[in-house]
């Protein structure tokens, strides 16, 4: 599924990401835009053999199990396929664990490079939430 901007904002708010651990909703929508272009089925292979999955491009070396990433930690205790669902519950639950580590949203390279320090509220402007 490819979400609309405001549709994703509403879904993320419903799933408790607005101000989760201090990160406003705009941060999460911005991250999703530049990680996956709002596409829940996005996958991208990394040079280390791991793969990033789903709307927030969650990595298989650390967070999920795809059966093909050597030494996977699977910290979210989920199959990576769950992160490709049109239901973003699994991606959000896992993202909450990721952001609860010391690096916060810096764990997402796209957020760090494209969203951090910008007017992230623009990503939810005009949305009826």
């Amino acid at each position: 599924k490819v979400f609309g901007r405001c549709e994703l904002a509403a879904a993320m708010k419903r799933h408790g990401l607005d101000n989760y651990r201090g990160y406003s909703l705009g941060n999460w929508v911005c991250a999703a835009k530049f990680e996956s272009n709002f596409n829940t089925q996005a996958t991208n292979r990394n040079t280390d053999g791991s793969t990033d999955y789903g709307i927030l491009q969650i990595n298989s070396r650390w967070w999920c199990n795809d059966g093909r990433t050597p030494g996977s930690r699977n910290l979210c205790n989920i199959p990576c396929s769950a992160l490709l669902s049109s239901d973003i519950t699994a991606s959000v639950n896992c993202a909450k664990k990721i952001v609860s580590d010391g690096n916060g949203m810096n764990a997402w390279v796209a957020w760090r490079n494209r969203c951090k320090g910008t007017d992230v509220q623009a990503w939810i402007r005009g949305c009826r939430l």
Partner: antibody, heavy 113, light 107 residues
């Protein structure tokens, strides 16, 4: 099946340091986030802090100057240290997996002269 | 810190009744609310995560609802093994905080 077991002295004197160990079996502690939570007499629960897979620690600000959570990845153990204890620190101390799925059985610590 | 308030403090029910336990947050916490059951001399047991998500191995008579500041744990047809303390906990903002608990007792 993940199992957690707390251990440590049941009696600590005021002003001393409370030191507890949580031994984890069934999973590597580097594959999770691990918490210390305590329950006071009268049923109040307090989330003391947690340590993440990367070793990052988060402490309840009410305890920040007194608390330390560490780990030994080879022994697969977590540690809680609470300095300068008072009678107000009398409680049952639990280690738990961060998601709340797994808990130790708890160990009761009394602070008393 | 976010203050979590549970009501009532004690609930007296007969097995077979259906009950609702309330938890209120002092500010919005989205769906970042979890419910635990604790029986005497036992560790807490996770019943519901993220306000309404079920937990493997927990009987289907337990369900959760709510978002923002008001949450409810419902037990559809209470069984004798359900008596004990129930706590809510928020994980939206650090430090995470618990409610004061509701004691579910036999009438």
């Amino acid at each position: 099946e993940v199992q957690l077991q707390e251990s440590g002295p049941s009696l600590v004197k005021p002003s001393q340091t409370l030191s507890l160990t949580c031994s984890v079996t069934g999973d590597s502690i580097t594959r999770g986030y691990w918490s210390w939570i305590r329950k006071f007499p009268g049923n109040k629960l307090e989330y003391m802090g947690y340590i993440s897979y990367s070793g990052s620690t988060f402490y309840n600000p009410s305890l920040k100057s007194r608390i330390s959570i560490t780990r030994d990845t080879f022994k697969n153990q977590l540690y809680l240290q609470l300095n300068s204890v008072t009678t107000e620190d009398t409680a049952t101390y639990y280690c738990a997996e961060y998601d709340g799925t797994y808990w130790g059985q708890g160990t009761t610590v009394t602070v008393h002269h | 810190d976010i203050l979590m308030t549970q009501t009532p403090a004690t609930l007296s029910v007969t097995p077979g009744d259906s009950v609702s336990l309330s938890c209120r947050a002092s500010q919005s916490i989205g769906n970042n609310l979890h419910w635990f059951q604790q029986k005497s001399h036992e560790s807490p047991r996770l019943l519901i995560k993220y306000a309404s998500q079920s937990i493997s191995g927990i009987p289907s008579r337990f369900s959760g609802s709510g978002s923002g500041t008001d949450f409810t744990l419902s037990i559809n047809t209470v069984e004798t093994e359900d008596f004990g303390m129930y706590f809510c906990q928020q994980s939206n903002s650090w430090p995470y905080t618990f409610g004061g608990g509701t004691k579910l007792e036999i009438k």
